[in-house]
Interface confidence: medium
Amino acid sequence: EEELQIIQPDKSVSVAAGESAILHCTITSLFPVGPIQWFRGAGPARVLIYNQRQGPFPRVTTVSETTKRENMDFSISISNITPADAGTYYCIKFRKGSPDTEFKSGAGTELSVRAKPS
C-alpha cells in the first residue's frame, strides 16, 4: 500500500481581485479512508475553506468530481477573490473517525491578491 502524499504543486498563486483562484491538490493514495478539507492559515486560528463532507461553500467549487470513490484530485476554485482571501491554503487529509482526525497536510499554497485592473 503506497504511502499517502498530498501534492500541492504551486508554492504561490497570484490572482487579481474579482477573479477566480484555482488551488491544486492531488493525493497519491485512497487510504486511509476519510475526507479532504481545505484551510486558510495554520494552527488554531485557521479558517475552514472547504470540507468534502459538509457545506455549502458558496464561493468554492471542486475542479473534478470529488464524490467519485476513486477520485484523487481535490483541487478547488474560489470565485470572486478579494484581498481578504490572501493567505496560505493547506489541503489536508483526515482519517475517518468520531471525530475525524487530521492525518496529513500538503505543503501549502500562498494566495496573493492583486488590485483589480482599472
Partner: antibody, heavy 119, light 108 residues
C-alpha cells in the same frame, strides 16, 4: 547576477565521507529553496535533495536517504551536502540549483563539482 | 513517482533544420514541466517552464507545447550553439522531482 559556486568534490574510497558546499550570491539566499542535483558519467540528471529557505523542510531521493544530509547557513549564503557511506554509484558531478520562487523548477545552476568514489 | 521518457535518444540534424523533442510522463503533470539545455563544462540552463513559457533571455526559436502526459520542445531553426543535450523535468508530483533521460541533438 545570480552565482552558485560548488566546492568540496574529490576522490574518496567507498564508505568514506565528503562535504560539498555551494556559495550563493546575487539573490536573497534565505528566500529560496535550494537543491542538489547530480549527473553520473554518461547519464542523465538525478535530483538528490531539497531544503526550504528556512531549512525547516527537507526531502531526499530514496537513493541517498539515510546517508546524505542537506543543510544551509543563511548567514553565510551557503548550501551544504554531507555525504556519508559513499558508494561507487554516487560518482557524479553534483550541481547546486536554485528553485524558482513559485514552482519547483530550477532557475539557476552552478557549474558543479565532481565526486569520484573508487577503491 | 512520475517517470519521464524522452525520445528520441539522439537527434542528428543540420544547422537550419527544425528539431522536435518529445517528453512523455507516466501520469498527468498538467503543465508543470520544464526543459533544460546542457552543454559540456557548462551549467544546465532553463529554457522552458510551465510547458510553454520561455525563460528570461531564451531566443524565440525555442518553443514548448503540451499538457497532461505528452510534451514537445521545438527548435525552429537549429543554430550551431543549440547542439547539446536537452532534459525535461516535471514539478507536479514531488518529491522526488524527476527528469527525463535526455535527448542529444548532434550535428549531421
Amino acid at each position: 547576477d545570480v552565482q552558485l559556486v560548488e566546492s568540496g568534490g574529490g576522490v574518496v574510497r567507498p564508505g568514506e565521507s565528503l562535504r560539498l558546499s555551494c556559495a550563493a550570491s546575487g539573490f536573497t539566499f534565505s528566500s529560496y529553496d535550494m537543491n542538489w542535483v547530480r549527473q553520473a558519467p554518461g547519464e542523465g540528471l538525478e535530483w538528490v535533495s531539497l531544503i526550504s529557505g528556512s531549512g525547516e523542510i527537507i526531502y531526499y531521493a530514496d537513493s541517498v536517504k539515510g546517508r546524505f544530509t542537506i543543510s544551509r547557513d543563511n548567514s553565510k549564503n551557503t548550501l551544504y551536502l554531507q555525504m556519508n557511506s559513499l558508494r561507487a554509484e554516487d560518482t557524479a558531478v553534483y550541481y547546486c540549483a536554485k528553485e524558482n520562487n513559485r514552482y519547483r523548477f530550477f532557475d539557476d545552476w552552478g557549474l558543479g563539482t565532481l565526486v569520484t568514489v573508487s577503491s | 513517482e512520475t517517470v519521464l521518457t524522452q525520445s528520441p535518444g539522439t537527434l542528428t540534424l543540420s544547422p537550419g533544420e527544425r528539431a522536435t523533442l518529445t517528453c512523455r510522463a507516466s501520469q498527468s503533470v498538467y503543465t508543470y514541466l520544464a526543459w533544460y539545455q546542457e552543454k559540456p563544462g557548462q551549467a544546465p540552463r532553463l529554457l522552458i517552464y510551465g510547458a510553454s513559457s520561455r525563460a528570461t533571455g531564451i531566443p524565440d526559436r525555442f518553443s514548448g507545447s503540451g499538457s497532461g502526459t505528452v510534451f514537445t520542445l521545438t527548435i525552429s531553426s537549429l543554430q550551431s550553439e543549440d547542439f547539446a543535450v536537452y532534459y525535461c523535468q516535471q514539478y507536479y508530483d514531488r518529491p522526488p522531482l524527476t527528469f527525463g533521460g535526455g535527448t542529444k541533438v548532434e550535428i549531421k
